[in-house]
């Protein structure tokens, strides 16, 4: 699927269901208790496919991964399968630097939430990354949305600079990640 970045535009362009960020330096100032606290500004490069690249065209490169911000609404499971079809997985956050990069990207879409690759079967079982690895709350806290009416939000999304649990069936955007070896 081709998504085109118009370099003469100061905003994010959405074509064919993908959001491409310029990683502008002026969006969303850090606020207290947000995930942006103490995060160094990061640089991301969008691939065009013209030069040799470890990422598919129009994915964003950051460190050793390629990222695609999908703007088609889907459940968590549907989003996971959408990423699989693109040879990737829902986002797994491995470091504070990566977290800062992701926050910077999604903060330019303050009205939208994005599924990441964290889920659990039910509240008594720990959160698990999509690849089966353990979740450590040292990296970030998951803010709960649980209520009496909605007692089991067992999937996770990021909204601006906060990570929340949410009902897995709620349609949302998503972030696909494809790791590569340097």
């Amino acid at each position: 699927t081709m998504a085109i970045w118009r370099s003469n535009s100061g905003s994010n362009t959405l074509e064919n269901g993908y959001f491409l960020s310029r990683n502008k330096e002026n969006h969303s100032q850090p606020t207290q208790s947000s995930l942006e606290d103490s995060v160094t500004p990061t640089k991301a490069v969008k691939t065009t496919g013209v030069l040799s690249s470890p990422c598919p065209p129009n994915w964003i490169i950051y460190e050793k991964s390629c990222y695609l911000f999908s703007m088609s609404l889907n459940s968590w499971d549907g989003s996971k399968r959408q990423c699989w079809q693109l040879g990737s997985n829902l986002l797994k956050i491995d470091s504070s630097n990566e977290l800062g990069f992701i926050v910077k990207q999604v903060s330019s879409q303050p009205d939208n939430s994005f599924w990441i690759g964290l889920s659990r079967p039910q509240t008594e079982v720990p959160w698990l990354w999509e690849d089966g690895s353990t979740f450590s709350s040292n990296l970030f806290q998951i803010r709960t949305t649980a209520t009496q009416e909605n007692p089991s939000p067992n999937c996770v999304w990021i909204h601006v600079s906060v990570i929340y649990d949410q009902l897995c069936s709620v349609p949302s955007y998503s972030i696909c990640e494809k790791k590569f070896s340097m």
Epitope: Q122, L128, T134
Partner: antibody, heavy 118, light 107 residues
Framework: QVQLVQSGAEVKKPGASVKVSCKSS????????IHWVRQAPGQGLEWMGW????????NYAQKFQGRITMTRDTSISTAYLELSRLRSDDTAVFYC???????????WGQGTLVTVSS | DIQMTQSPSSVSASVGDRVTITCRAS??????LAWYQQKPGKAPKLLIF???SLQSGVPSRFSGSGSGTDFTLTVSSLQPEDFATYYC?????????FGPGTKVDIE
């Protein structure tokens, strides 16, 4: 490639304890739960519990509470299962397995036969 | 604890046959179910996770389906190396539990 290598077969007397080791390689040991599963001769599979190698947190099946201990040594990427107060019906092959997607067990050790006999 | 039952307990089949094994959970487990193959004297091998996702390296003749309480493992065209015992496993709640197994042997 991911590998889990277990310690050798053991013969124990009733009332004794046994400690089985499971050495991991080919991945970051602290990133994935290690499960222990046992299989009595000619029987099915039985989940005993898990350990989070990063934190050391454990979760044991109620059936084994009080006589099971799971530990790990991150410096040598090894998980351990200790079962005490052994009975003859504890005779089984004990497997370690690495957690994978959706809490499945994607990689298994070769198994350790523990025989409990007087 | 969630009880897992499998049927049939054993099945005789020939190479090329389509074989279907069912697994039922005593309560809903969404899609938190895995399937394993075990041969005598060997450790189990993961075939399917998340009820329907094929583990890397597993032949595409294996497929899984179902959600909630009823699940199916299908082998579309049985090969000589597929004669083994198959187990389902729920990962929805502690303790994780396995089905009793289905033995697939040569007719």
């Amino acid at each position: 490639q991911v590998q889990l290598v277990q310690s050798g077969a053991e013969v124990k007397k009733p009332g004794a304890s046994v400690k089985v080791s499971c050495k991991s390689s080919g991945y970051t040991f602290t990133d994935y739960y290690i499960h222990w599963v046992r299989q009595a001769p000619g029987q099915g599979l039985e989940w005993m519990g898990w350990i989070n190698p990063n934190s050391g947190d454990t979760n044991y099946a109620q059936k084994f509470q009080g006589r099971i201990t799971m530990t790990r040594d991150t410096s040598i990427s090894t998980a351990y299962l200790e079962l005490s107060r052994l009975r003859s019906d504890d005779t089984a092959v004990f497997y370690c397995a690495r957690n994978s997607a959706s809490y499945s067990f994607g990689y298994w050790g070769q198994g350790t036969l523990v025989t409990v006999s007087s | 604890d969630i009880q897992m039952t499998q049927s049939p307990s054993s099945v005789s089949a020939s190479v090329g046959d389509r074989v279907t094994i069912t697994c039922r959970a005593s309560q809903g487990i969404s899609s938190w179910l895995a399937w394993y193959q075990q041969k005598p004297g060997k450790a189990p091998k993961l075939l399917i996770f998340g009820a329907s996702s094929l583990q890397s390296g597993v032949p595409s003749r294996f497929s899984g389906s179902g959600s909630g309480t009823d699940f199916t493992l299908t082998v579309s065209s049985l090969q000589p190396e597929d004669f083994a015992t198959y187990y389902c496993q729920q990962a929805y709640s502690f303790p994780f539990t396995f089905g009793p197994g289905t033995k697939v042997d040569i007719e």
